[in-house]
Interface confidence: medium
């Protein structure tokens, strides 16, 4: 069955910069990717970026750049303008709409004791949702 993986990493060079990586493991073509923060059921629940093969890519602050890495994975660079980093305890969710499989969503966050430049392994998080 299809799966979505999410990994969040702190950039080694800038402690206020984070990158969210998401990927879809499964057949079918990706028709839409939505990245949000706050968790699917958490507080906030705001879209950070939308990536669409036809519509193109849009992102909202504090997202800096959203881009396709492969046909089935994306990355989203985030930049914190404040002195401390609010991203450390934040859950990021990636939702992939795939034809004909449907929609799959997974969430991840920065590991609690992450060193700069390290990231969680790109394994599926057990809150996958399938249609």
């Amino acid at each position: 069955t299809p799966e979505v993986w999410v990994q969040v990493q702190m950039e080694a060079t800038e402690l206020s910069s984070f990158t969210v990586h998401c990927g879809f493991l499964g057949p079918g073509s990706i028709s839409l990717v939505t990245v949000s923060w706050g968790g699917p059921d958490g507080a906030g629940g705001t879209k950070l970026a939308v990536l669409h093969p036809e519509l193109g890519t849009r992102q909202w602050a504090p997202a800096r750049q959203a881009r396709w890495e492969t046909q089935s994975s994306i990355s989203l660079a985030l930049e914190d303008s404040g002195a401390s980093s609010p991203f450390a305890n934040t859950t990021f969710c990636c939702k992939f709409a795939s034809f004909p499989e449907g929609s799959w969503e997974s969430c991840g966050s920065l590991p609690p004791s992450s060193d700069p430049g390290l990231s969680a392994p790109p394994t599926p998080v057990p809150i996958l949702r399938a249609d």
Partner: antibody
Framework: EVQLQQSGPVLVKPGASVKMSCKAS????????MHWVKQSHGKSLEWIGI????????SYNQKFKGKATLTVDKSSSTAYMELNSLTSDDSAVYYC?????????????WGQGTSVSVSS | DIQMTQTTSSLSASLGDRVTISCRAS??????LNWYLQKPDGTVKLLIY???RLHSGVPSRFSGSGSGTDYSLTINNLEQEDIATYFC?????????FGGGTKLEIR
Amino acid sequence: EVQLQQSGPVLVKPGASVKMSCKASGYRLTDYYMHWVKQSHGKSLEWIGIINPYNGGTSYNQKFKGKATLTVDKSSSTAYMELNSLTSDDSAVYYCARDSSNVGNDMDYWGQGTSVSVSS
Amino acid sequence: DIQMTQTTSSLSASLGDRVTISCRASQDISNYLNWYLQKPDGTVKLLIYYSSRLHSGVPSRFSGSGSGTDYSLTINNLEQEDIATYFCQQGNTLPRTFGGGTKLEIR
């Protein structure tokens, strides 16, 4: 205050085309996608398609491919929808609606609607 | 495409009542469910997004709940200005789809 001001009602003959407008104010047009929705008389809402005003990218409901064309004019903060080869089935009220930045993928502000009547 | 079904097409209630409107999706939409009202003059407004979150400026008497395929909108202490048609909409996939609407009338 976010507002979407749509063009006035039109009466057109079968086979003709019509182009309606949706002028955005209170926010920057290019920051949000724009949806277009059809409502036939006394019926439910049908999603036509969506446009990214930033780059003009579009995605359509399969049912409306070839029928509707979505465009934007960034300089005037206006989104447009053109309908071609009109028939009586196209008589309806058409709404533009802003795609929000909420996680729900909702449409947070709507225009007042443009009524299109197709009759010979 | 995901089909959205509002089984009740019209509903009568008295002012002050508590009213519940339901909506069912043809497949799991993972809380990506939004509610709108359409006034008799055609004006459409967002009420609830992501199943239960109140859009800014919407009175707290409106609330949403549900998960999976079944969702509901509740209006507490019904007011005259709530007389409208209510639509649900799924935001889970493209194309976006709407329920058939539930027209709320005063008894």
